[in-house]
């Protein structure tokens, strides 16, 4: 049993025992492993119900995965003196169902935050901004990983989950410096239209494995730094002209569209024309039609306008019952 202050080269990570001594600025909390050399603390799969209070001041990378935290209150990481070095915080798979406003306040160097695999029934609009001001102090966050944070249906609030997440992303315009945002596997049916406008620095956006049917009301126009846009494994049927033009206008972007149920009818003509000339779409020759049945498995790039027909809609007077 020893604290991080008595670290030895033969044991870079030291598990601590509960101690009667007062907390020291560089001691290792109970049920955690610490490496001062690596500036890392790991409290992993220990069924912790709250964030340890006695985290060492040197901590730069903090892993709190696989616990039972349930609620992350305001100031969950606020310490005196503050954890000024903490840059990467991983809380994935810790059974969080509530993240309150100001949960990540007083972490001036926090660049990467991973809340994945927590069933967040409640995510405060001020979880990342820390205040309810219309314009808050900029968050230091550069990478925000929110994969599979959708709660089970019976735990959802009345408001839409998409709306709740969007509110947290845009509050106070705090995340203007965000470069990476992962929102995969969240059952999103739509993307609230204002979200991307508030995240102008995004370089990597992962919306894969959701249930997005359309991007008609989503604007990518101001994401001029975007390099990767992941839309695989959604329910996209077609991309319309407005979306195509916006994507084409982004100077560095690569778009991933695999495993969507493309509907190859007359509405697909513009997208097919665009696919044939764009360099934006990765693996574009692997995009295939899912509907109608007669077109299933056809490669989009190999379609021509004659292939893309729509059944005529008869006027009511000509329809038979």
């Amino acid at each position: 049993t020893s604290s991080a202050s008595s670290s030895s080269s033969s044991a870079p990570f030291l598990a601590s025992a509960a101690s009667a001594q007062p907390p020291l600025p560089d001691q290792c909390p109970a049920l955690c492993e610490c490496s001062e050399a690596a500036r890392t603390v790991k409290c992993v799969n220990r069924n912790l119900t709250e964030v340890p209070t006695d985290l060492p001041l040197y901590v730069r990378n903090l892993f709190l995965t696989g616990n039972q935290l349930a609620v992350l209150p305001a100031g969950a990481f606020a310490r005196r003196p503050p954890l000024a070095e903490l840059a990467a915080l991983n809380l994935s798979g810790s059974r969080l169902d509530e993240v309150r406003g100001g949960a990540f306040e007083h972490l001036p160097s926090l660049r990467q935050l991973d809340l994945s695999h927590n069933p967040l029934a409640y995510l405060s609009p001020f979880a990342f901004s820390g205040s309810n001001a219309s314009i808050s102090a900029p968050s230091p966050l550069v990478e925000l990983i929110l994969n599979h944070i959708v709660p089970p249906d019976d735990k959802r609030q009345n408001r839409s989950f998409e709306g709740m997440v969007a509110a947290a992303l845009v509050a106070g315009r705090a995340l203007q410096g965000l470069h990476l945002l992962e929102l995969a596997s969240n059952h999103f049916l739509y993307l609230p239209r204002d979200v991307l406008a508030q995240l102008p620095s995004l370089r990597y956006l992962d919306l894969s494995n959701n249930s997005l049917v359309s991007l008609t009301y989503v604007s990518f126009r101001n994401l001029t730094h975007l390099e990767s846009l992941h839309l695989e494994d959604n329910a996209l049927k077609v991309l319309h002209n407005g979306t195509l033009a916006e994507l084409q206008g982004l100077p560095h972007v690569r778009v991933f569209l695999d495993n969507n149920p493309w509907v190859c009818d007359c509405h697909m003509a513009d997208m097919v024309t665009w696919l044939k000339q764009t360099g934006v779409v990765q693996g574009k020759d692997r995009l295939t039609c899912a509907f109608p049945e007669k077109m299933r498995n056809r490669v989009l790039l190999e379609l021509n306008s004659a292939d893309l027909d729509c059944d005529p809609i008869l006027p009511p007077s000509l329809q038979t019952s």
Partner: antibody, heavy 116, light 107 residues
Framework: QVQLQQSGGELMKPGASVKLSCKAT????????IEWVKQRPGHGLEWIGE????????NYNEKFKGKATFTADTSSNTVYMQLSSLTTEDSAIYYC?????????WGQGSTLTVSS | DIQMTQTTSSLSASLGDRVTISCSAS??????LNWYQQKPDGTVKLLIY???SLHSGVPSRFSGSGSGTDYSLTISNLEPEDIATYYC?????????FGGGTKLEIK
């Protein structure tokens, strides 16, 4: 109707190469991927890779890179798979299938026997 | 690579029985799963695509279900011509991978 007709059985010596063929009829040949699948005696199915005939685009299972090479002849609606440096492990039935999100039509299979 | 596992390698049932064949993936595959039938003469046919869609010409006694990592094929009323080996296959990520197969025999 869609049909995939594969070449007949082959008996080859170790170290040799062989080229199996798969002729497609009944659909727009360039509009669909063609898949190749291996089945060793008493074993299951193993995906080798795929080719998009109109473009020559290919994807290979890492395990078969350097072993299998796909080509296509759009004038005869035929896809070929060449297997090189044959060993007894290559003895199997090889199927071609029309692909994409699923393999909806299959050839009858070509049996390759490698023996000294 | 995604591993596909069919835990039952052979299955014996009587004509008219309801038979269920299961298949599990080593990671979530988003319902991107197909089922194939291979007859004793080597002929292979697609039965079910995208977990539950019946391929044209396939009898309605065949059905598929599942999500995430666990999937199944059900034959509701076993007929003599259903004697075959059944394979699941994922197409969520390259390389495509097949299960080891379940051989169905008549009691």
């Amino acid at each position: 109707q869609v049909q995939l007709q594969q070449s007949g059985g082959e008996l080859m010596k170790p170290g040799a190469s062989v080229k199996l063929s798969c002729k497609a009829t009944g659909y727009k040949f360039t509009g669909y991927w063609i898949e190749w699948v291996k089945q060793r005696p008493g074993h299951g199915l193993e995906w080798i890779g795929e080719i998009l005939p109109g473009r020559g685009s290919t994807n290979y299972n890492e395990k078969f890179k350097g072993k299998a090479t796909f080509t296509a002849d759009t004038s005869s609606n035929t896809v070929y798979m060449q297997l090189s440096s044959l060993t007894t492990e290559d003895s199997a039935i090889y199927y071609c299938a029309r692909g994409g999100r699923d393999f909806d039509f299959w050839g009858q299979g070509s049996t390759l026997t490698v023996s000294s | 690579d995604i591993q596909m596992t069919q835990t039952t390698s052979s299955l014996s049932a009587s004509l008219g029985d309801r038979v269920t064949i299961s298949c599990s993936a080593s990671q979530g595959i988003n319902s991107n799963l197909n089922w194939y039938q291979q007859k004793p003469d080597g002929t292979v046919k697609l039965l079910i695509y995208y977990t539950s869609s019946l391929h044209s010409g396939v009898p309605s006694r065949f059905s598929g279900s599942g999500s995430g990592t666990d999937y199944s094929l059900t034959i509701s009323n076993l007929e003599p011509e259903d004697i075959a080996t059944y394979y699941c296959q994922q197409y969520n990520k390259l390389p495509y991978t097949f299960g080891g197969g379940t051989k169905l025999e008549i009691k």
